[in-house]
Interface confidence: low
């Protein structure tokens, strides 16, 4: 059982109150984290509570304001970036969100040496992406899908690309599908370590089918939003990688980096770029059928000013049991010799572990091993490798930080975080300064989050950066639910679950059960993290038991569980939720006439299929922005797990796994279907088709749409959504308002 913030004695329990929905919607109990913005081995920047940008030196203990809140306010800046030579700061304002990561903004350059904004050759607006070179103060930016370079902020720009066109050619920024499903960034350009070269991707979306939807706004006629969006089996973007010498761009044009022959022979993706040195770069490519990935190390040829990618420097990663990698193919972390690297991939037992590759993947040396998984490599120094894993005490939903000494033989392993604040902190991430001289640990729970600063040599805690004292005080008179993380063993499958129990939980009583599900491939819902959210309120105030279950297809427990859903989405994820519900009923405290399920996105798909499973287990359920057919979702994501929707591949299962095919089965459940009309990700089309199928089957259901809202249903829609879902559940469970 996970103990939440300490309780006062029973005698005082009357003064304590349950969580309210208002608490949740107002974000009353949200927490803060502290991630230093490292600018050297021992210095970092941080934006203070009053919005000054402050530079901290760990070794001298000194701090000083490099940019005042007055300067920030003068241009309404919401973000900043210091040039590596510390001469200039860019200030970002007029933030305008586009998709999940992308946004446009206006940028101003402030000269720290004279305390004035740079005048002359100002940046155009709005800019799609802007960044400093890693050394000095060169600027690269993307404007109207073309890349520009400035040697100094006041210089005229040098235009690198000329073919950028809205919705057609994207230079230095990803198109929709690469942003969401492959790169997970707003940018597609990468400076070499010393700023000599700039690599960038060009995405050609000319032949991609376009998704069009209405944006109602408040004009007389709605606008139509058009996005090149490849759905499963459709034509994909064509990607090319170029590198330009930024020192002499006036005569060295962009040079294309060749694609490995075994990749170029059919449709393919570019998955990531990692600079090794100024004259060595590593590119990762992936076949459209995503079980073959190639890592290609390329070298600069001075004579021809081109990039050479010898076959001897191609490393192939192939999965025979599923797709390549986890959610994404892992990226390499190069060692100091600039040719060997560390990388996470499946070992012979099907667990993802760190391997050291010196010459070939076949000769890789396994660095970690066991029936657990290495999750992230944070930093490799001359003598240490820092990584995170879920090894400690065999809880897959934990994250601890480990250090392996690679400078000595045999390498020794030390858990840096396992015993620091064992009850409070079981789920960590880390942020390292240059050469790992210092690092910050950010603990997300299960107790109240805390951020601390540590010495990279001794691991000694130097100071607390953020401990959320105000939150701790605010929670003192709140009756929080109890949480437990346990596992069920069913037919050789381990199902980890998190159960959220009402504050005065009594095993001899019967409680309504709400299953919250996501269940997408390589996801994890059962994590030892702190949260005060909607389901906390439902347990605290409304007396519900809430359960989250990680079934087949979920991550960090080995390939057997992960790849079980390969080419069969919508089968085992649903089965495992149902199996878990049956086990929960057997525990004796669940009212089996009051069981509901809800989920969002992939979770909306799973909850819909669970409701339509014909088991009679669920009284009601909610699907928010669900996928309803895999033919409607993005190619990159869908085909990774499902293959192609063609007769000679996997069309049959594409057809069998739709929500619409099960319309009849919704007759005996109460179903609430919710979707935003401007969802760029899971298109409103998905819910429109469910609704049409239910109408055609003459099945009654409830629905709510959110006009002009995207996949996140943000702002006032959030309040309306959770209020609406609360009413629906309380009605379903016969709870008084």
């Amino acid at each position: 059982i996970v103990l939440r913030p300490s309780r006062v004695h029973n005698s005082e329990e009357n003064t304590m109150r349950a969580l309210t929905l208002k608490d949740i919607l107002n974000g009353t109990f949200s927490y803060k984290t502290f991630f230093p913005n490292w600018i050297s081995g021992q210095e970092y920047l941080h934006q203070s509570a009053d919005n000054n940008i402050v530079l901290y030196n760990i070794e001298t203990g000194q701090s000083y304001t490099i940019l005042s809140n007055r300067t920030m306010k003068s241009v309404n800046a919401s973000n900043y970036g210091l040039s590596p030579d510390r001469q200039f700061v860019y200030l970002e304002s007029d933030y305008s969100k586009l998709w999940r990561y992308s946004y446009t903004a206006t940028y101003y350059i402030y000269d720290l040496s004279n305390g004035e904004f740079v005048r002359g050759n100002e940046l155009p607006r709005p800019i799609q992406y802007l960044c400093w070179s890693p050394v000095g103060s060169k600027l690269a930016y993307v404007y109207q899908n073309n890349i520009y370079l400035k040697q100094r902020p006041g210089d005229p720009p040098f235009q690198i690309t000329f073919n950028g066109r809205e919705n057609k050619i994207f230079n230095g920024i990803p198109d929709w599908v690469y942003e969401e499903e492959m790169l997970a960034t707003k940018y597609a350009l990468w400076w070499s370590p010393n700023g000599k070269f700039l690599a960038y991707a060009e995405f050609n979306d000319t032949d991609i089918p376009v998704i069009a939807y209405s944006y109602y706004g408040d004009e007389q006629y709605p606008r139509t939003i058009n996005i090149p969006y490849p759905k499963a089996g459709a034509k994909n973007p064509v990607v090319r990688i170029f590198i330009i010498d930024t020192t002499y761009p006036a005569y060295v044009g962009p040079q294309e980096v060749p694609v490995p022959a075994m990749i170029a022979s059919s449709d393919y993706y570019f998955s990531w770029l990692t600079w090794v040195t100024d004259e060595r770069v590593c590119l990762q490519w992936l076949k459209r059928v995503q079980n073959v990935s190639v890592l290609s190390i390329c070298d600069f040829r001075e004579d021809w000013q081109t990039w050479d990618c010898p076959k001897t420097q191609e490393h192939i990663e192939e999965s025979r049991t599923g797709w390549a990698g986890g959610f994404f193919v892992s990226t390499p972390v190069f060692s100091y010799d600039a040719i060997s690297y560390y990388k996470i991939f499946s070992d012979k037992d099907g667990y993802k572990h760190i391997h050291y590759i010196k010459d070939t993947v076949e000769n890789a040396i396994q660095i970690t091993s066991g029936k657990w998984e290495a999750i992230n490599i944070f930093r490799v120094t001359q003598d240490s490798l820092f990584y995170s894993s879920n090894e400690f005490e065999e809880y897959p939903g934990r994250r601890n930080i480990y250090r392996i000494s690679i400078g000595s033989y045999p390498p020794s392993k030390k858990c840096v975080t396992c015993h620091l604040r064992k009850e409070r902190c079981q789920y960590y991430t880390a942020s390292f300064s240059d050469y790992a001289k210092y690092y910050a640990l950010v603990c997300y729970g299960p107790g109240i989050p805390i951020s601390t600063l540590h010495d990279g040599r001794t691991d000694q805690e130097i100071k607390i950066l953020e401990e959320n004292k105000e939150l701790e005080n605010a929670l003192k008179n709140i009756q929080l639910p109890k949480e437990e993380i346990k596992k069920l063993e069913v037919d050789e499958i381990t199902l980890w679950y998190k159960m959220i129990l009402p504050p005065q939980f009594d095993r001899s009583k019967k409680y309504p059960l709400l299953i919250q599900v996501y269940g997408g491939p390589c996801s994890q819902s059962v994590r030892s993290v702190f949260a005060v959210n909607w389901i906390s309120y439902l347990a605290s105030k409304e007396g519900m038991v809430i359960a989250l279950v990680d079934g087949r297809g979920t991550a960090f427990q080995g390939d057997k569980l992960l790849y079980a859903v390969y080419r069969k989405l919508g089968v085992y994820e649903v089965e495992d939720q149902i199996t878990a519900v049956r086990k929960f009923i057997e525990m004796g405290f669940i009212d089996e006439k009051r069981i509901a399920i809800w989920g969002w996105s992939y979770g909306g798909y799973v909850s819909s299929l669970a409701l339509a499973s014909g088991t009679g287990l669920f009284k009601c359920g909610i699907a928010v922005a669900p996928v309803s057919s895999w033919e409607y979702y993005a190619s990159v994501y869908t085909e990774r797990f499902m293959g192609l929707p063609t007769k000679d591949d996997n069309l049959e299962h594409y057809k069998n796994s739709t929500v619409m095919a099960r319309a009849e089965y919704f007759r005996n459940v109460d179903y609430l279907l919710i979707h935003g009309t401007a969802d760029d990700n899971v298109h409103f089309q998905n819910s429109a088709q469910i609704a049409k199928a239910l109408v055609n089957a003459q099945v009654d259901f409830q629905a709510m749409w959110y006009s002009d809202q995207n996949h996140g249903l943000s702002g006032l829609s959030t309040n309306h959504l959770y209020t609406h879902m609360t009413h629906f559940l309380k009605q379903c469970f016969s709870l008084s308002d």
């Epitope: 040098f158 073919n163 006036a250 005569y251 294309e256 001075e302």
Partner: antibody
Framework: QVQLVQSGAEVKKDGASVKVSCKAT????????ISWVRQAPGQRLEWMGE??????TPNYAQSFQGRVTITADESTSYMEVSSLRSEDTATYYC????????????WGQGTLVTVSS | DIQMTQSPSSLSASTGDRVTITCRAS??????LAWYQQAPGKAPHLLMS???TLQTGVPSRFSGSGSGTDFTLTITSLQSEDFATYYC?????????FGQGTRVEIK
């Protein structure tokens, strides 16, 4: 305004060598690449190779590799063709690379080289 | 090497005519295409880069279009000084290559 001024016309015998110069007047090549392009009578333009004075390493088209030598200092580039044959009779141009090395924005007036047997 | 093919090889036109010259690349060259004009006995002169961008000082009656493999140079109203040979050139992949030229002569 940069101008590229080339050396005068040459008549050479079969098997001889010729060296053509290209001088930047009113400035230096200042970081730009200098390409050499030839045009046989009534034929298309043919790129022979280039040199970036800052890098100093020439690049040659495959068909000219081994027979052509391109050199440069800050304001003059030279192109030498050895083992001349009658098919080398052509006008030889030097040209400056613009923002892309092979995009040629300023050209010399051309040097006619006639190879006679 | 990338082959560049122009058509027609020559054309006759009168002053004031609209003239279109096409250029095809043997593989995708994106927009990395230049057009040059060469008057008889003179050196080539850069008209256009990036397939569509006129060089400073080039009259607006010249325009370019296309990307990928197919490109066009259009002169909307032919003037006497426009009678010359026109070459397209790709500067996308080394070595740069030229089309065989299109001679525009007076009808």
């Amino acid at each position: 305004q940069v101008q590229l001024v080339q050396s005068g016309a040459e008549v050479k015998k079969d098997g001889a060598s010729v060296k053509v110069s290209c001088k930047a007047t009113g400035g230096t090549f200042s970081g730009h690449a200098i390409s050499w392009v030839r045009q046989a009578p009534g034929q298309r333009l043919e790129w022979m190779g280039e040199i970036s004075p800052m890098f100093g390493t020439p690049n040659y088209a495959q068909s000219f590799q081994g027979r052509v030598t391109i050199t440069a200092d800050e304001s003059t580039s030279y192109m030498e063709v050895s083992s001349l044959r009658s098919e080398d009779t052509a006008t030889y141009y030097c040209a400056r690379g613009a923002n892309y090395r092979a995009l040629l924005d300023y050209w010399g007036q051309g040097t006619l080289v006639t190879v006679s047997s | 090497d990338i082959q560049m093919t122009q058509s027609p090889s020559s054309l006759s036109a009168s002053t004031g005519d609209r003239v279109t010259i096409t250029c095809r690349a043997s593989q995708d060259i994106s927009s990395y295409l230049a057009w040059y004009q060469q008057a008889p006995g003179k050196a080539p002169h850069l008209l256009m880069s990036g397939a569509t961008t006129l060089q400073t000082g080039v009259p607006s009656r010249f325009s370019g279009s296309g990307s990928g493999t197919d490109f066009t140079l259009t002169i909307t109203s032919l003037q006497s000084e426009d009678f010359a040979t026109y070459y397209c050139q790709q500067y996308y992949i080394y070595p740069p290559t030229f089309g065989q030229g299109t001679r525009v002569e007076i009808k």
